[in-house]
């Protein structure tokens, strides 16, 4: 008889993670007597995958019934493939021997590549908020995919971004890969409702890319603009001064009224008006009993927004000579009327 040949017909096999991989192997003869073994890798460090002779290989099944003597098919199926199973598999015929079986002939090998889906991309923004016109960085990460080829794109409100840098690790061969990308985004005042999207395309996704999103509302701080005005009043001895706090984000805001530099009242913004662009407006007002003042009053609206340094706007309230004459006996405390914010709910 001709000497036995070990035939592995496929040079490579590609399988999706979670599926079974069939590795084909056939012998041209039954001689010599001895077991068939499958290994991953070659040389001294090769890993035993299946031994016809002995052992427990729960993920491996033989495609044919090996107990049939005339069977020359030694193909195996490996279940529940993971990226860690990638490698070159060799079907090897051994001759029965002692103290160990003697390797007789090996097949040429079949390279198993595993197609593994990338994990859902996770997009994270900056740790601290930034104001419009500043640039912030967003990162996108996805892991566990194979093969290495992958495409990542960034979008802001549907418009593709170009200022980003992407790395796929590791650089060399690996069972699976990770991608990390950093995009730089210039903030604008209207970005409270904006979104950045990281989009990943990979062969395993069959044209249906994965997306991860982040809201710019988590990254932006729009500082308020202040306007202090006096409203007309019917009563001669009262002045109504309002502080209009406009176009701020996020909500957290504390307002303090000062009269001639002294704190008269502090309040926290609660009922806000939301603008179309996602920013908020709020109005506070102060009733001043002009009879209580002999001299002109400087009213200051001081706003602390989102834990930042306070901004303020002042208004000089003129006290007429007539009011000065009649109001000397009214105490400063009694001159302050209770106030409430103007405007509807936000």
């Amino acid at each position: 008889e001709d000497e036995l040949q070990v035939i592995q017909p496929e040079k490579s096999v590609s399988v999706a993670a979670g599926e079974s991989a069939t590795l084909r192997c056939a012998m041209t003869s039954l001689i010599p007597v001895g077991p068939i073994m499958w290994f991953r890798g070659a040389g001294a460090g090769r890993e035993l995958i299946y031994n016809q002779k002995e052992g427990h290989f729960p993920r491996v099944t033989t495609v044919s019934e090996l107990t049939k003597r005339n069977n020359l098919d030694f193909s195996i199926s490996i279940s529940n493939i993971t990226p860690a199973d990638a490698g070159t598999y060799y079907c090897v015929k051994f001759r029965k021997g002692s103290p160990d079986d003697v390797e007789f002939k090996s097949g040429a090998g079949t390279e198993l590549s595993v197609r593994a889906k990338p994990s859902a991309p996770v997009v994270s923004g900056p740790a601290v908020r930034a104001t419009p016109e500043h640039t912030v960085s967003f990162t996108c990460e996805s892991h566990g995919f194979s093969p290495r080829d992958i495409t990542l794109k960034w979008f802001k409100n549907g418009n593709e971004l170009s200022d980003f840098q992407t790395n796929v690790d590791p650089a060399g061969d690996s069972v699976s890969y990770s991608i990390h990308s950093t995009a730089r985004v210039v903030l604008t005042r209207g970005d409270v409702h904006s979104q950045v999207i990281c989009e990943i395309a990979h062969i395993t996704l069959q044209g249906d890319p994965l997306r991860g999103t982040a809201n710019l509302s988590e990254a932006i701080r729009v500082p308020p603009t202040l306007e202090v005005t006096q409203q007309p009043m019917r009563a001669e001895n009262q002045a109504n001064v309002t502080c209009q706090v406009s176009n701020f984000y996020p909500r957290g805001l504390q307002l303090t009224w000062l009269e001639n530099g002294n704190v008269s009242r502090t309040e926290t913004a609660s009922t806000l008006i939301e603008n179309k662009d996602g920013t908020y407006n709020w109005m506070s007002w102060l009733l001043v009993n002009t009879c209580a003042h002999r001299d002109d009053v400087v009213l200051t609206c001081q706003v602390e927004h989102d834990g930042q340094q306070a901004v303020s706007k002042s208004y000089a309230l003129e006290i007429s000579a007539h009011q000065k004459e009649h109001g000397s006996d009214i105490t400063h405390e009694a001159a302050l009327a209770p106030t409430a914010p103007l405007g509807g709910s936000g």
């Epitope: 002779k53 090996l66 103290p99 079986d101």
Partner: antibody, heavy 118, light 107 residues
Framework: EVQLVESGGGLVQPGGSLRLSCAAS????????MHWVRQAPGKGLEWVSA???????YYTGSVKGRFTISRENAKNSLYLQMNSLRASDTAVYYC????????????WGQGTMVTVSS | DIQMTQSPSSLSASVGDRVTITCRAS??????AAWFQQKPGKAPKSLIY???SLHSGVPSKFSGSGSGTDFTLTISSLQPEDFATYYC?????????FGQGTKLEIK
């Protein structure tokens, strides 16, 4: 059903000859290594001879040159031609099938008795 | 030739007992050791091959172990039908050789 049935045993004088047959059913005999094993009365088992799928033959030292193992594929049968028989060859002779890949004995015949006596 | 030495040559045990028979090869035989059971007037029956693999239809109360030169056959819980003679065998190289046998008798 896989089965081996031996025949051809009997009483023979020392120096005489005998041909044992083993008829296989339920499998193709030529696809397996086949063996003869004997057991002298009240004694243990002794391997005698084997024939491989390629027709290669093997014998234990005490029968070399006297016994010949062969097979006839058309009849799916195994044979043991025994010449120059001695009293020490008296035994029950079993036909045995070797296992698929390692030649471990898996199927035994019921045996046939060979008695060498004058 | 490779010699196979079995011990003990005979063994008395009771129903329900766990018994172990050992076999030593005169040189390493990898794990090409087999065990057979034979009852009086009957052909041997194959129990175990490659030291620890059970032949089809053999009950799991039989188990084998070993590699190299030392091998064991264990019967976990003896039943009346298990009283017989047991043989080990090496089949790594010709001539294949058997142990002298262990006769397992009822106590």
């Amino acid at each position: 059903e896989v089965q081996l049935v031996e025949s051809g045993g009997g009483l023979v004088q020392p120096g005489g000859s005998l041909r044992l047959s083993c008829a296989a059913s339920g499998f193709t005999l030529s696809s397996y290594d086949m063996h003869w094993v004997r057991q002298a009365p009240g004694k243990g088992l002794e391997w005698v001879s084997a024939i491989g799928t390629a027709g290669d033959t093997y014998y234990t030292g005490s029968v070399k040159g006297r016994f010949t193992i062969s097979r006839e594929n058309a009849k799916n049968s195994l044979y043991l031609q025994m010449n120059s028989l001695r009293a020490s060859d008296t035994a029950v002779y079993y036909c045995v099938r070797g296992g698929v890949w390692d030649d471990a004995f898996d199927i035994w015949g019921q045996g046939t008795m060979v008695t060498v006596s004058s | 030739d490779i010699q196979m030495t079995q011990s003990p040559s005979s063994l008395s045990a009771s129903v329900g007992d766990r018994v172990t028979i050992t076999c030593r090869a005169s040189q390493g035989i990898n794990n090409y050791a087999a065990w057979f059971q034979q009852k009086p007037g009957k052909a041997p029956k194959s129990l175990i091959y490659t030291a620890s693999s059970l032949h089809s239809g053999v009950p799991s109360k039989f188990s084998g172990s070993g590699s190299g030169t030392d091998f064991t056959l264990t019967i976990s819980s003896l039943q009346p039908e298990d009283f017989a003679t047991y043989y080990c065998q090496q089949y790594v190289s010709y001539p294949y050789t058997f142990g002298q046998g262990t006769k397992l008798e009822i106590k």
